[in-house]
Amino acid sequence: EAHKSEIAHRYNDLGEQHFKGLVLIAFSQYLQKCSYDEHAKLVQEVTDFAKTCVADESAANCDKSLHTLFGDKLCAIPNLRENYGELADCCTKQEPERNECFLQHKDDNPSLPPFERPEAEAMCTSFKENPTTFMGHYLHEVARRHPYFYAPELLYYAEQYNEILTQCCAEADKESCLTPKLDGVKEKALVSSVRQRMKCSSMQKFGERAFKAWAVARLSQTFPNADFAEITKLATDLTKVNKECCHGDLLECADDRAELAKYMCENQATISSKLQTCCDKPLLKKAHCLSEVEHDTMPADLPAIAADFVEDQEVCKNYAEAKDVFLGTFLYEYSRRHPDYSVSLLLRLAKKYEATLEKCCAEANPPACYGTVLAEFQPLVEEPKNLVKTNCDLYEKLGEYGFQNAILVRYTQKAPQVSTPTLVEAARNLGRVGTKCCTLPEDQRLPCVEDYLSAILNRVCLLHEKTPVSEHVTKCCSGSLVERRPCFSALTVDETYVPKEFKAETFTFHSDICTLPEKEKQIKKQTALAELVKHKPKATAEQLKTVMDDFAQFLDTCCKAADKDTCFSTEGPNLVTRCKDALA
């Protein structure tokens, strides 16, 4: 229903704490360079204004849209052009163009320093002094680095953070309590970020229909006992929630997500038998829990999919009658039978089925033409299954770091023009799929591997879009979202690439590497590995292994030496010479 004052409506629905958190996230995602204090000031002003509208919905400006109110706030920031350049031009536009302009200027890779976690004592001190400000800083720092982070989920992670600090800051050994717990939250939040970015990409590039198809497949896998009307309702509502969040309408998004959670909990009987535990939790935990709830038990007596979609004499009539509904029903029926498939694979199968009907229903004898469609799915299913087997075998043999290195070599050969930091980041993320998915039961591996890889490759595409350098990457990124992963997997060595000349300074290291944390050391070594491949794209695995082993030995020796600097300056050039010889 329409409200006199949108801002008062959202404030009342969300409550002050969530309202302020969401406004802070929104501002931090739009203006990524502003300091926390600048944003906190704006948030307070917006909140004070919302309260005046709650008291009197007819007060001045209370009837304005949220985009107008928030946009006016952002455009009033001093030195906007100096700090943000052409983003300031957005302020010359009217809504809704102004908001669209802000969205287009969101930067997926902002030049901000990595978010460093303070040491435990300092963290606990500032948390105890002012928990609200402390959590505000967390929301601000995450949101500005991840401008498409799913806002209500970020509130959930902040709540997790808060609970961990409350618990650990009361312990004697704060450090050993905080580190593993906060690392766990960070890992989950980073995965959440790339997954949500993929959803926004789907929405931005291919529209609501594409996202809704993704949602139908995913929900049908999770809720195989729900009927198609129920799945359609959930998918429609979920599409609206994600559209709002991807579009920067964070208050509406969070409000509608809470409504969806409420609906699901009130209609468990028609959705799933697995929801009760989630539904007993408070709002943020409830919505998070529902988003990753375990799959319900599949109905025992599901008929073969062929009955309705191949053997039925009226397939073409039913398809022509309501194409989207018929294809939606197919996707629903196939997905509920296959929780062991990735959503990407299910969407590829639905696309294949649609193409088959389009072709066959125009022919003289359609049943003879589409009769083999399910058999034609086989190669599409085998390809990702083989990918999972090959990669999980390799992961089990090499471990995470070795597996990342194997992927780094593979992807540097596929797209050597891509910047080394991007290749290293991508390979490290892709390599984590082993730890994340290969340890799961067999029937959960494929959905875990492929849907995670797709999300990571989406980030590769977004970064590459900013500065396109590789025709291979452009080709894979410009196709449909579900075809990206198979496209990247099929890429081979880029034969058009002219190898980089060997620069000794690229492979020159200093004693400061010895004191770096293990993760940073790995990144340095992986940077060197990518540069080696760029120098010798056709180097064999054996050659690269020889060089990397030599490099690791060199680091080990020099970092243990009494005079590290001398060791690095004398042994370093020898290492460079040996590398050149090994790769000659």
Epitope: D227, F228, A229, E230, T232, K233, L234, T236, N267, A269, T270, D308, E314, N318, E321, A322, V325, F326, T329
Partner: nanobody, 118 residues
Framework: EVQLLESGGGLVQPGGSLRLSCTAS????????MGWVRQAPGKGLEWVSW????????YYADSVKGRFTISRDNSKNTLYLQMNSLRAEDTAVYYC???????????WGQGTLVTVSS
Amino acid sequence: EVQLLESGGGLVQPGGSLRLSCTASGFTFRHYRMGWVRQAPGKGLEWVSWIRPDGTFTYYADSVKGRFTISRDNSKNTLYLQMNSLRAEDTAVYYCAKSYMADRFDYWGQGTLVTVSS
């Protein structure tokens, strides 16, 4: 095009029974959730009952629970509503509805009038 044709309405005494039928055409009946909606004189539309495509799950409004039974025969493209222990407040036009999505319906028939009166 989609057609829904209700029948079986009429005048009945309180405590009596009626069976409504709805014959569907123009769409794949077995793929859709179907239901009955009613409108009492001077009132808004109210969901009475709905049934899943495969007939495995049924929903009833609190006001009719235990008295009404919905069923379907997918081979005949027909939906039924068995109404027992009828009361004066059940007087309404009953519409057969095709539901494309939970809590929404996109097509309904012309309706059949049920009058419960002594």
